[in-house]
Amino acid sequence: MGCDRNCGLIAGAVIGAVLAVFGGILMPVGDMLIEKTIKREVVLEEGTTAFKNWVKTGTTVYRQFWIFDVQNPDDVAKNSSKIKVKQRGPYTYRVRYLAKENITQDPEDHTVSFVQPNGAIFEPSLSVGTEDDNFTVLNLAVAAAPHIYQNSFVQVVLNSLIKKSKSSMFQTRSLKELLWGYKDPFLSLVPYPISTTVGVFYPYNDTVDGVYKVFNGKDNISKVAIIESYKGKRNLSYWPSYCDMINGTDAASFPPFVEKSRTLRFFSSDICRSIYAVFGSEIDLKGIPVYRFVLPANAFASPLQNPDNHCFCTEKVISNNCTSYGVLDIGKCKEGKPVYISLPHFLHASPDVSEPIEGLHPNEDEHRTYLDVEPITGFTLQFAKRLQVNILVKPARKIEALKNLKRPYIVPILWLNETGTIGDEKAEMFKTQVTGKIKLLGMVEMALLGIGVVMFVAFMISYCACKSKNGK
């Protein structure tokens, strides 16, 4: 009878030990299985979870616009006063709803190439007005022409055309015209076949971004989604030195197993450069733990503050010999037009940039860019891309519309907030397929280990207690 009990206790302890060992073994083995599954599923090829979402994003992406309505156009043009602006918005469009096209796998170098079609659908219910709302903004063609043609002879010619077309420094345009294009009356007088349509995002609809060629991760998962080339080149030809490199992914996803210490590098064709984000905080997104990566102020710093940025300073006059910061001259990428990109309301920009503009209120929470990345898969499940489009306008002696200006202005035209968040359904699916399974496996591992250890300790204590009792 005593033997039976002792044997039972030993058996219980052994079972507990086995469970604990099994739980312990399941930890690295399970992690290995998870890693293997993740590695298999994040590869960009037909049949994987990643590929399906990559071809056509499951996230609804909105682009909100706020237009800077100029309140004192005549005063600025006549007296070179500070420009008083008032932001109006949001005006919301649905974007990135079109699937990638011309998808071609190259098994040789483990890449996949594609183009991303552009399209924008106005969402009246998410907007403060209609596409026909009017705004007073800088005259894009009048501001750009003397910048492109710095030749004094041609400026006299252009002045004749500007006067004839009754154009001036500022103009009134509808939202639709300003964003997507309008026939400019001054450019229409140029007697050569030039493009006379002007718009901040013209041309956009029915155009494509790319060709992108990215690594599919089949041979090396740590390279998945990283851009190998853009428009057939490994460099942009916009910047000197390493600033011209195409680094990282397109920010829609990153190689899996993201660590907080990692700097996420990505390329954005909107700003014609590669940039980076650093870990900010851990947040819970619809029950999924994600890492929030933010664009640091350092990325927009002057070469004085961040020497790595020296090659993004391509002109010395407007940048006050590269001491100004927070604005990026992307003219080389925009056919020589004087386009400057910044964060909204000149967030993280030097005081000299915003000084000539009244009515700006930079705010870190509203105006910063962030990416919420699920660390196991590397998928970006939520993001907010915020940027501002500005045009440089300079005094031009030969152009009457600009001759009274006493200083150059970097004039804010609009700022945008492009956001995407994983849908509730998709989030549930993601939890079930990824985080749920990992949680479940973790729970099973812990349960086995816990139950096993408890059983082993309890049965061993009971066995020892019995043994000492019997001994007495």
Epitope: N151, F153, V154, V157, S160, L161, Y192
Partner: antibody, heavy 117, light 107 residues
């Protein structure tokens, strides 16, 4: 087809006046602007005057300022060069030429102006 | 005013030769330079604008180079019809100014 035809040249006495015409076809002169360029016998080319597109502005070489006037009649698609107080050194072949960005893509055949007593 | 100095003022060459004519501006004119060919008794003809841009219908043996203050017109292989006088012109600032010309003669 773009064509420019000058007329009005001839022999004139020093101190005299002459009006040169430049009839354009194949394009509208107001859209481009018209220049007058002259070439003294055996010498190089010298820019004389310019009327900017849409009659925007007129420009003259220092050597003719105050004596020559450039004008255009858009209804006739013709440019003119009114030359007063002519001097012997104004003797040259006068060409009218079309330009927008400052280079001359079309030229007339030229008309000879001789200033001599 | 911007002075345009052409050199040489004349040169003798044979058919098939490579000919180079230079032009120097008295100040920076960026790439706003044009080149013309003129034959006796005729109006000048545009060859090149913006220092390097070949005008339509002009044979590809003509090419232009340079930026800032120094410019060059090159005829890669001289043809019989190329014997003429060549002028450079700046179209950067009014008054527009020409070089004094380079006469290309048969050797």
């Amino acid at each position: 087809e773009v064509q420019l035809v000058e007329s009005g040249g001839g022999l004139v006495q020093p101190g005299g006046s002459l009006r040169l015409s430049c009839a354009a076809s194949g394009f509208t002169i107001s859209s481009f602007g018209i220049h007058w360029v002259r070439q003294a016998p055996g010498k190089g080319l010298e820019w004389v005057a310019w009327i900017a597109p849409y009659g925007g502005e007129e420009y003259y070489a220092d050597s003719v300022k105050g004596r020559f006037t450039i004008s255009a009649d858009t209804s006739k698609n013709t440019a003119y060069l009114q030359m007063n107080s002519l001097r012997a050194e104004d003797t040259a072949v006068y060409y009218c030429a079309r330009s927008f960005f400052g280079y001359f893509d079309y030229w007339g055949q030229g008309t000879l102006v001789t200033v001599s007593s | 005013d911007i002075q345009m100095t052409q050199s040489p003022s004349s040169l003798s060459a044979s058919v098939g030769d490579r000919v180079t004519i230079t032009c120097r501006a008295s100040q920076d004119v960026s790439n706003w330079v044009a080149w013309y060919q003129q034959k006796p008794g005729k109006a000048p003809k545009l060859l090149i604008s913006y220092a390097t841009s070949l005008y339509s219908g002009v044979p590809s043996r003509f090419s232009g180079s340079g930026s800032g203050t120094d410019f060059t017109l090159t005829i890669s292989s001289l043809q019989p019809e190329d014997f003429a006088t060549y002028y450079c012109q700046q179209h950067s600032n009014a008054p527009l100014t020409f070089g004094q010309g380079t006469k290309v003669e048969i050797k």
